[in-house]
């Protein structure tokens, strides 16, 4: 019967006794940087070309005996997971292997860098179709390795890496921490994070998504027909490399940003038990398990958005945190979050010709996060309209006044440490959805965009009594672009988007009174693109 991991990534309409997805990734080449491999295993023979690239350190220990099957174990298994005939994800993908890990599974940053350069040169000499590079390795944070990954990604190569098996924040490791790389954590058959001895999968904001990574059956280098079960984020990354190969084979023109957005969009949502992660990492870690799209074509009409968390600002009074979108993405909204609730809001600002989301810590605060909502919006023209703090008691307001521009997000930022928390909440006048409303002491920022066929609407959900969390979701066919809290409440920790749901978090209810200021309203801005929908219908 079908191995559990292949069943897990397969949409229900393709499920059968055998895993036979519609396109095997035949137009894509996957580079594997790992150990040596047993290329004559019948699972991968003829599918994997062993390049002459080898850059590995000496094995440790005088009593170490090289045994071919042990040296090849990790790489052979991963090659099988990506493109194996029988237990592989992308059965049509061809692979090239580069040896950057020795027989003990150890490598060097310099060896990996030279390997990446080898791929870049190969690509220049003989351009082929889409390229996926699988980096099933993790070492300490390396600015130089991350920079090399960025360069290769900007040359159009899709890089997929393991989050690491240290039960730690993936941002502390490379290449997992490189923003341009698709970083993959590991889950098991119960969709729970994988435990590996006393350690386990890495987590945190640098992880893009999770994938099957425990008891994964794959080619064993022991013999030509042998199979073995292995576990780890390397196996998880191999699944995503395979899924990416299939998506790119179906749509070869996909950019890295489009591919990442699709991987996120088609993932299974909210199935991971977050209790496994450290409490401070739960909100930062994506609750996504990779899956193949239900159809390899026709996803182009959707407005895709993802949430990008910044690094923590740190606790100093004037500390800020910045969240950035990928070069091909539009920043459609910006929000902030602080566990202590002490923050001075957030603003969208230009940096290097691109909008970024900046959150501001407040005096006595433990630090803030900036949260960017990053979307794929072709031909978009977006700008930020700012209203300074108002004199009137009605609060500050700003709207999108340019013809054809629609509101995609609201941010508010204040200079004062205390917003006058005992003022009654400000209510938005009905029938004015295209404007942002805030405290009179705050400056308000509206993200206004013009794009063909773009339409947006505001959706609110208010709860009169104090709640730790208030949510509002966009309905089917609409995509969440903006998430904020209606002003007037003292205990809001911040707002952020989780998939298509806007989440507004408040302080522990027991610490706040149930006065009128206890009311919390979550405000979602939901958008869709009629232009994208029409374009896709024309293609079909």
């Amino acid at each position: 019967s079908i191995p559990w991991n292949l069943e897990r990534i397969t949409p229900p309409r393709y499920r059968a006794d055998e895993y036979q997805p519609p396109d095997g990734g035949s137009l894509v080449e996957v580079y594997l940087l790992d150990t040596s491999i047993q290329s004559d295993h019948r699972e991968i023979e003829g599918r994997v070309m062993v390049t002459d690239f080898e850059n590995v350190p000496e094995e440790d220990g005088t009593r170490f005996h090289r045994q071919a099957s042990k040296c090849d174990s990790h790489g052979t298994h991963l090659a099988g997971v990506v493109s194996g005939r029988d237990a592989g994800v992308a059965k049509g993908a061809s692979m090239r292997s580069l040896r950057v890990l020795n027989c003990q599974g150890k490598g060097t940053v310099s060896g990996t860098l030279i390997g990446l350069e080898f791929i870049r040169k190969s690509q220049l000499v003989q351009p082929v179709g889409p390229l996926v590079v699988l980096l099933p390795l993790a070492g300490g944070y390396s600015r130089v390795l991350n920079a090399a990954c960025q360069r290769l990604a900007r040359a159009g190569v899709v890089l997929v890496t393991a989050a690491g098996n240290f039960r730690d924040d993936a941002c502390l490791y490379s290449p997992a921490s490189a923003p341009e790389v698709i970083t993959v954590g590991a889950t098991n058959a119960q969709d729970q994070p994988v435990t590996l001895g006393t350690l386990g999968t890495n987590f945190g904001r640098c992880v893009d998504l999770f994938a099957p990574g425990e008891d994964i059956i794959g080619a064993s280098s022991d013999c030509s027909t042998c199979f073995v079960s292995q576990s780890g984020t390397s196996q998880a990354a191999a699944h995503v490399a395979g899924i990416a190969a299939m998506m790119l084979s179906a749509e070869p023109e996909l950019t890295l940003a489009e591919l990442r957005q699709r991987l996120i969009h088609f993932s299974a949502k909210d199935v991971i038990n977050e209790a496994w992660f450290p409490e401070d990492q739960r909100v930062l870690t994506p609750n996504l398990v990779a899956a193949l799209p239900p159809s390899t074509h026709g996803a182009g009409w959707q407005l895709f958005c993802r949430t990008v968390w910044s690094a923590h600002s740190g606790p100093t009074r004037m500390a800020t945190a910045v969240a950035r979108c990928a070069p091909d993405e539009e920043l459609l909204s910006c929000s902030s979050f602080s566990r202590s609730g002490k923050r001075r809001g957030e603003r969208m600002e230009a940096q290097g010709g691109k909008l970024v989301c900046r959150a501001h810590n407040a005096f006595g605060g433990e630090g803030v996060y900036a949260i960017a909502r990053c979307c794929l919006l072709p031909q978009a023209n977006c700008s930020v309209h700012t209203a300074p703090p108002a004199e009137a008691s009605m609060g500050t307001r700003v709207h999108c006044h340019q013809q054809g521009h629609v509101l995609t997000g609201c941010s508010s930022h204040w200079e004062v440490e205390d917003l006058g928390t005992h003022k009654p909440p400000v209510l938005r006048p009905r029938g004015q959805p295209n404007q942002c409303v805030g405290h009179r002491e705050a400056s308000i920022h509206a993200s206004c965009c013009h794009a063909p066929g773009l339409e947006c609407k505001v959706k609110e959900h208010g709860i009169p009594a104090p709640q730790e969390q208030v949510t509002v979701a966009c309905e089917e066919g609409w995509t969440l672009t903006g998430c904020s809290a209606l002003p007037g409440t003292s205990h809001v920790l911040g707002a952020y988007a989780v998939d298509n749901t806007c989440v507004v978090r408040s302080r522990d209810v027991s610490t706040t009174g149930s006065t009128s200021e206890g009311a919390v309203t979550a405000v979602a801005i939901c958008c869709r693109s009629r232009h994208l929908a029409q374009a896709s219908q024309e293609l079909q």
Partner: antibody
Framework: QVQLVQSGAEVKKPGESLKISCKGS????????ISWVRQMPGKGLEWMGM????????HYSPNFQGQVTISADKSISTAYLQWSSLKASDTAMYYC????????????WGQGTLVTVSS | DIVMTQSPDSLAVSLGERATINCRSS????????????LAWYQQKPGQPPKLLIY???TRESGVPDRFSGSGSGTDFTLTISSLQAEDVAVYYC?????????FGQGTKVEIK
Amino acid sequence: QVQLVQSGAEVKKPGESLKISCKGSGYSFTNYYISWVRQMPGKGLEWMGMIYPGDSYTHYSPNFQGQVTISADKSISTAYLQWSSLKASDTAMYYCARDYWSKPYFDVWGQGTLVTVSS
Amino acid sequence: DIVMTQSPDSLAVSLGERATINCRSSQSVLYSSNNKNYLAWYQQKPGQPPKLLIYWASTRESGVPDRFSGSGSGTDFTLTISSLQAEDVAVYYCQQYSSFPITFGQGTKVEIK
């Protein structure tokens, strides 16, 4: 039920070409390997090679490499064994058998095709 | 190539008696990754194709009578017919399926004494 049905017996002259077949039914033909096994009169079993119909990957025994060609047509769930120029020493019973990645032994065999090469 | 050697070449056993066939491989077919022996036993009756009896050296194929059993590990294996029946008259082959080319033993002919 699962079965492999082979084409009928053949009598050929040396130098002639021949293609015998093995049709699978009752299972997903593309997901199983098909091997060909030779048994010369009064002798034992010799593995000749195999094919994976899913992608037409083949692997031959060195003893048979270049002597025969294994192919498959997955649209009709059929594997083939062919000779471009038969020799008298090719006289034998030829069996096809299937195996699976997690069960790499031959659990189902065809009934055999007797090939006689004689001038 | 892994060479499979069976002994004896032929065996005559009385009905109801035990028949034992040995098979030796030139290199181990036991693999640490899954702790399995990549060895099978087949029975071939006159005019019929071979039939799978035992796989993974000791696992009986469904429908095979329990008088057939396989044992051994690494390089030395045994097929035992605990109580020979008339219908067991056949040639028995061991096979390794771990490495290419796949190889068979030369066969052991079992007859009734």
